[in-house]
């Protein structure tokens, strides 16, 4: 697993370097998670032919994965910093149950899956410190999450692999959109 942000050898070797700003730390954290997702996607794609699945088939899924929409204020047109930040944090909180589902799903990248999960928790904390309107952030219901996780794990093998592929793809897209939006803040 890659070394988490702020723990690489360059940081140790350069004690006089300016500490990272909050925005830089968030940027670095997202890029670190995206690297982790790439490694997980690599294993998934090597294991099965899921990655060749058509966009149409993937669109017809029973999941309710977070997705950026125009109304969320994260796109260049109609950009709204506060609305967007709330959407990013809410979306990441909603992704947590899906990241839990990914645990124990990887043979050679087991540590990587755990790192993505833990780094996302840290990213949420960073972003919550940045947000002014924490009351607008809705936390998913733990009971609903528990039954969703049970339902996902009950699926047949092919469906589980499709679900894994879709979660990774959607999480990557969500993080990329978030990264672009956060760089405008």
């Amino acid at each position: 697993a890659p070394v988490p942000p702020g723990e690489d050898s360059k940081d140790v070797a350069a004690p006089h370097r300016q500490p990272l700003t909050s925005s830089e730390r968030i940027d670095k954290q997202i890029r670190y998670i995206l690297d982790g997702i790439s490694a997980l996607r690599k294993e998934t794609c090597n294991k099965s032919n899921m990655c060749e699945s058509s966009k149409e088939a993937l669109a017809e899924n029973n999941l309710n994965l977070p997705k950026m929409a125009e109304k969320d204020g994260c796109f260049q047109s109609g950009f709204n910093e506060e609305t967007c930040l709330v959407k990013i944090i809410t979306g990441l909180l909603e992704f947590e149950v899906y990241l839990e589902y990914l645990q124990n799903r990887f043979e050679s990248s087991e540590e990587q899956a755990r790192a993505v999960q833990m780094s996302t928790k840290v990213l949420i904390q960073f972003l919550q410190k940045k947000a002014k309107n924490l009351d607008a952030i809705t936390t998913p219901d733990p009971t609903t999450n528990a039954s969703l996780l049970t339902k996902l794990q009950a699926q047949n093998q092919w469906l589980q692999d499709m679900t894994t592929h879709l979660i990774l793809r959607s999480f990557k897209e969500f993080l990329q959109s978030s990264l672009r939006a956060l760089r405008q803040m």
């Epitope: 088939a57 017809e60 645990q103 124990n104 043979e107 009950a154 699926q155 047949n156 092919w158 469906l159």
Partner: antibody
């Protein structure tokens, strides 16, 4: 050629135990999920238990009526799946089939011939 | 759990005619554009034999007179033309998720 062969059935008294075995051949067993399905005259076909391959968690699933009494296990080195049945009742009487769900679609494409369990005093 | 209601419980069809068996699921068995509904034929003293998988695909070596259709919660198995060898029990089964469930069965006979 895929083959599934069950063994271990017979007559057992209520409250007793029995262990069924299923020997598989003709496919990569360690990658496969394996299931037990039973059939009784009054209940028709009923799925009993499933054991999954590594990287799928939880690894075992059971139908409600057998949970806590039955245990499904596997030995990849022997290409075998087992069903340990404890505290048996008359309602467990039936033909027990070992079956394999196909990766694409999860349908049971191969079945063993079945082994009969009779629970009676 | 997904409950499968199969109808009719028994059916008598003349040789050469069409037999239609229905299966209704208590919730959708669809996902990713696929329907996880399967059909089995069973003759006395034999294990079930796969006829149709994922709603409309024929199992290996299954004659073309067997066809399946449907999506979501409503499915059907069609046998046309009916042959003597088709006298058997027929079951629908969902393979979307555990607990995998079966319909109660349809006994098909020749009229």
């Amino acid at each position: 050629e895929v083959k599934l062969e069950e063994s271990g059935g017979g007559l057992v008294q209520p409250g007793g135990s029995m262990k069924l075995s299923c020997a598989a051949s003709g496919f990569t067993f360690s990658d496969a999920w394996m299931d037990w399905v039973r059939q009784s005259p009054d209940k028709g076909l009923e799925w009993v238990a499933e054991i999954r391959s590594k990287t799928y968690h939880p690894a075992t699933y059971y139908t409600k009526s057998v949970r806590g009494r039955f245990t499904i296990s596997r030995d990849d080195s022997k290409s075998s799946v087992y069903l340990q049945m404890n505290n048996l009742g008359a309602e467990d009487t039936g033909i027990y089939y070992c079956t394999r769900p196909r990766y694409y679609g999860g349908y049971f494409d191969y079945w063993g011939q079945g082994t009969t369990l009779t629970v009676s005093s | 759990d997904i409950v499968l209601t199969q109808s009719p419980a028994s059916l008598a069809v003349s040789l050469g005619q069409r037999a239609t068996i229905s299966c209704r699921a208590s919730e959708s068995v669809d996902n990713y554009g696929m329907s996880f509904m399967n059909w089995f034929q069973q003759k006395p003293g034999q294990p079930p034999k796969l006829l149709i998988y994922t709603a409309s695909n024929q199992g290996s070596g299954v004659p073309a007179r067997f066809s399946g259709s449907g999506s979501g919660t409503d499915f059907s198995l069609n046998i046309h033309p009916m042959e003597e060898d088709d006298t058997a029990m027929y079951f629908c089964q969902q393979s979307k998720e555990v607990p995998y469930t079966f319909g109660g069965g349809t006994k098909l006979e020749i009229k």
